[in-house]
């Protein structure tokens, strides 16, 4: 999965000199870009991917640049004109945003400046300087206990729960030794209760990736469509869709000065959390959760339709839509069902329409297996 | 308040160890990298090392690498200094400061001396 | 490594002076450069950070500039707490490395 950048920084620089590019690993949690006639200056937290000085293009004028820090890719790396420059592969630290620092540096200023992260994914246009400098925090230790959660807590502990996903094998890198219904529950709660600016905010991580949306009053108006980005071509799922009807708002409304609702779409590729007895196969190993905040959403009018692009599978195995059940005493694994579910089958996309809200699945079913399926 | 004091200073001779601590107190010890420099009697300031916020990454003066090593426990907000192998010109008052575009908060430094 | 060189190693006035500290060094460090007061039995103390940047409650009689390899430590009016050991360091390349120091003391 292309993961965006945790960090961007673009802006233009007036190049009137033969000029270097420097980066400086700094002990501290701080990045930060510093302009002068001779140089370009890089600070930040992560070793340096050799050599620490360059230089730039020769000619002279106005350069588009751009500084790029991606954790997943544990790369930092700066983008000038057309020329781009690593700074370091090993930049897969989780920073937490603390504040962006006032510039006292004097030097030529940077032009046009912006910055976009995923604590503040709206691109910032910043006024002009000779130098920046975005401090960071460490992730809490530990959780806190009142009643919002740190979007950085919530992070690391996405970031906790996709190393498991990941190698699920390795018992030790579970988050807890909760069953999946309590981690689910628990992330939920996580999501929920998470503080943030806006009205979405999202959270991308290997093996899951969560958005939270904040309910409008007006949101019963419309019928909501979510795309997924596209995924990386050797998946079995390219891309999907939900469409969730505006009937499922209307019902979901606050009374007035109650606190607003919160729509949660959790997009897991991996179905560690979701095993059952019969160790069923998940297209694309794809479970897509669809929550509203402290509401169970079942017998809609109208339905929620998640749609599949997928790769063309064999003849004999049957795709259907299905949705995951816990066990209610939490005593054996949890199964699939299809029950108030459709699905609609075309070579390459499956829809499924279904009734209620839950976490969502295309099983894949040798064709002998189907009728076993619908029994549940 | 923002403090550092070390600990673990004292008479030692020379080939032995010596592990100097330096706890903190009064800001978020794991956000900051953190430094020891030393001080000969009567001498300028010479820097010895420093480790990142994370312990991820150690650089050290070219006259204690192999001899020394910086570590720290977040968790405990303490940074460390093992001594091994000292020698005679070791022998000075061991300041750990914080890393904040320069050195910005120092402890009161502990005084190591090595002799036989 | 890059070698800071102050000047004068002693710098002997009296209290209301002006005092102007030098640092030079051995290839450019941008403006990388910090200056500490040290007094006898003490710590040192943060002073200046990146050549001129004063550091949290210091007074204004202090002031520092230059950039690349020459820099001052300025001390407008001196006063009789003034009077110290003065190093200048620098953080733009490993090692760090520190000047030997200026003694300024009364006249």
């Known amino acids: 999965r292309g993961h965006r950048e945790d960090f961007r920084f673009c802006s233009q620089r007036n190049q009137t000199h033969r000029s270097s590019l420097h980066y400086k690993p700094t002990p501290d949690l701080r990045i930060s870009i510093e302009n002068s006639e001779e140089a370009l200056t890089v600070h930040a937290p992560f070793p340096a991917a050799h050599p620490a000085s360059r230089s730039f293009p020769d000619p002279r004028g106005l350069y588009h640049f751009c500084l790029y820090w991606n954790r997943h890719a544990g790369r930092l790396h700066l983008l000038y004109g057309k020329r781009d420059f690593l700074l370091s592969d090993k930049a897969s630290s989780l920073l937490c945003f603390q504040h962006q620092e006032e510039s006292l540096a004097q030097g030529p200023p940077l032009l046009a400046t912006s910055v976009t992260s995923w604590w503040s994914p709206q691109n910032i246009s910043l006024p002009s300087a000779a130098s920046f400098t975005f401090s960071f925090h460490s992730p809490p230790h530990t959780a806190a206990h009142n009643a919002s959660v740190d979007m950085c807590e919530l992070k690391r502990d996405l970031q906790l729960l996709s190393q498991f996903l990941k190698h699920p094998q390795k018992a030790s890198r579970r988050p807890s030794a909760a069953p999946a219904s309590q981690q689910l529950q628990s992330l939920e709660s996580k999501l929920t209760s998470v503080r943030f600016m806006g009205d979405m905010v999202s959270f991308e991580e290997d093996r899951i990736n969560a958005t939270v949306w904040k309910l409008q009053p007006t949101a019963g108006l419309q019928d909501l469509h979510i795309h997924s980005r596209q995924e990386e071509e050797q998946s079995e799922i390219m891309e999907y869709s939900v469409l969730l009807p505006r009937t499922l708002f209307q019902r979901t409304k606050g009374r007035s000065g109650e606190a607003e609702k919160r729509l949660l779409l959790v997009d897991f590729s991996s179905q560690a959390l979701f095993q059952d007895k019969n160790s069923s196969q998940v297209l694309g190993e794809k479970v897509l959760g669809i929550v509203v905040q402290n509401t169970k959403v079942a017998n809609l009018t109208e339905p929620v339709v998640l749609t599949f692009q997928h790769q063309l599978q064999p003849k004999n195995v049957t795709l259907q839509c299905v949705f995951w059940v816990e066990d209610p005493t939490l005593s054996s694994p949890g199964h699939w069902s299809s029950a108030g579910c459709e699905t609609v089958r075309r070579e390459t996309q499956t829809s499924c329409f279904c009734n209620h809200l839950t976490y969502f699945a295309v099983l894949m079913v040798s064709s002998v297996e189907v009728d076993a399926v619908h029994k549940h | 308040q923002v403090q550092l004091v070390e600990s673990g200073g004292g008479v030692v001779q020379p080939g032995r160890s010596l592990r100097l601590s330096c706890t903190a107190s009064?800001?978020?010890?794991?956000?900051?990298?953190m430094h020891w420099v030393r001080q000969a009697p009567g001498k300028g300031l010479e820097w010895v090392a420093v480790?990142?916020?994370?312990?991820?990454?150690?650089y050290y003066a070219d006259s204690v690498k192999g001899r020394f090593t910086i570590s720290r426990d977040n968790s405990k907000n303490t940074l460390y200094l093992q001594m091994n192998s000292l020698r005679a010109e070791d022998t000075a008052v061991y300041y750990c400061?914080?890393?904040?575009?320069?050195?910005?908060?120092w402890g009161q430094g502990t005084m190591v001396t090595v002799s036989s | 490594e890059i070698v800071l060189a102050q000047s004068p190693a002693t710098l002997s006035l009296s209290p209301g002076e002006r005092a102007t500290l030098s640092c030079r060094a051995s290839?450019?460090?941008?403006?990388?450069l910090a200056w500490y007061q040290q007094k006898p039995g003490q710590a040192p103390r943060l002073l200046i950070y990146?050549?001129?940047n004063r550091a949290t409650g210091i007074p204004a009689r202090f002031s520092g500039s230059g950039s690349g390899t020459a820099f001052t430590l300025t001390i407008s009016s001196l006063e009789p707490e003034d009077f110290a050991v003065y190093y200048c360091?620098?953080?733009?390349?490993?090692?760090?490395?520190f000047g030997q120091g200026t003694r300024l003391e009364i006249k």
């Open positions: 360091q620098q953080r733009d390349y490993w090692p760090i490395t």
């Open positions: 009064g800001f978020t010890f794991s956000t900051y990298g």
């Open positions: 990146d050549a001129f």
């Open positions: 480790i990142w916020y994370d312990g991820s990454n150690k």
């Open positions: 400061a914080r890393h904040l575009d320069s050195f910005d908060i």
């Open positions: 290839q450019s460090i941008s403006s990388y």
